[in-house]
Interface confidence: low
Amino acid sequence: CKAMHVAQPAVVLASSRGIASFVCEYASPGKATEVRVTVLRQADSQVTEVCAATYMMGNELTFLDDSICTGTSSGNQVNLTIQGLRAMDTGLYICKVELMYPPPYYLGIGNGTQIYVIDPEPCPDSDF
């Protein structure tokens, strides 16, 4: 297992609709054809997997149908979007990239993106 540098923004503010997007960029030491991207959430020293996708270079990322993540890839960059976020989901979102094929296997883990989510104020009742 060899180390690989992964860069991601330090802070991202989710939209009022609970959507946050950020770029995860990795320094590929070789010509990987199969890449796995995993988003981990760290909160209170607990790390949980948010979503993961394996893709062939040049193809779209495919997350599970019920995943809250979507994404696109371009070269060594992955554009990740997480949807359905609420204030309680505020935390550090870590991008992990694995170059699965061909060997040797490379693993890179970013420093994390702090995603802040603010629940929108409920609209006041209207008379009309």
Partner: antibody, heavy 124, light 107 residues
Framework: QLQLQESGPGLVKPSETLSLTCTVS??????????WGWIRQPPGKGLEWIGS???????YYNPSLKSRVTISVDTSKNQFSLELSSVAAADTAVYYC????????????????WGQGTLVTVSS | DIQMTQSPSSLSASVGDRVTITCRAS??????LGWYQQKPGKAPKRLIY???SLQSGVPSRFSGSGSGTEFTLTISSLQPEDFATYYC?????????FGQGTKVEIK
């Protein structure tokens, strides 16, 4: 509970091709978290890793066997298979299939589930 | 290829004994090492992964340690069901290789 079951002929003639299938039950072979592998053990000897496959079809082979080995996967049947061509008496062994897991804590792989093994004898 | 050398090849011990098996790698493998137990006619059983992490369901008398090139498997108090052959395996680089095995016999 995940289970792996090897199947195939127990006797193969020299110079022919050994073909084995591993059927996975209790879990999906298409999970992106795992590899699937073959290991063999000649009678009274140690273990030898033959090769591994990812559900996408990407393969990793032991160079000592690479010219004779083909590992394939059939996600629709939840199976993966081993073919070893031009067999000789030295290929007589118990053949195991296994799941390869990935430990996120350290980035290590490990074999966590094994089939019970099937003895393949190469003899005329 | 990375060569894995286990020592001793075999040992005799009594129930209750503390047993230590060593595995050496021909080059550094970080902590990418697993330990397996095998009984006659059975498939290997997972014991330790990542050099020192105990597989769930494995008794706590088993422990693993080491990093780099030297690793040990320790059985703190040998039980009757522990008499078996133990293998180490490196999963750091291809081809993944096993040690030759250590047979633990009853004294």
């Amino acid at each position: 509970q995940l289970q792996l079951q090897e199947s195939g002929p127990g006797l193969v003639k020299p110079s022919e091709t050994l073909s084995l299938t591993c059927t996975v039950s209790g879990g999906s072979i298409s999970s992106s978290s795992y590899y699937w592998g073959w290991i063999r053990q000649p009678p009274g000897k140690g273990l030898e890793w033959i090769g591994s496959i990812y559900y996408s079809g990407s393969t990793y082979y032991n160079p000592s066997l690479k010219s004779r080995v083909t590992i394939s996967v059939d996600t629709s049947k939840n199976q993966f298979s081993l073919e070893l061509s031009s067999v000789a008496a030295a290929d007589t062994a118990v053949y195991y299939c296994a799941r390869v897991s990935y430990y996120y804590g350290s980035g290590s792989y490990y074999f966590d589930y094994w089939g019970q093994g099937t003895l393949v004898t190469v003899s005329s | 290829d990375i060569q894995m050398t286990q020592s001793p090849s075999s040992l005799s011990a009594s129930v209750g004994d503390r047993v230590t098996i060593t595995c050496r790698a021909s080059q550094g493998i970080r902590n990418d090492l697993g330990w397996y137990q095998q009984k006659p006619g059975k498939a290997p059983k997972r014991l330790i992964y990542a050099a020192s992490s105990l597989q769930s369901g494995v008794p706590s008398r088993f422990s693993g340690s080491g990093s780099g090139t030297e690793f040990t498997l320790t059985i703190s108090s040998l039980q009757p069901e522990d008499f078996a052959t133990y293998y180490c395996q490196q999963l750091n680089s291809y081809p993944w290789t096993f040690g030759q095995g250590t047979k633990v016999e009853i004294k």
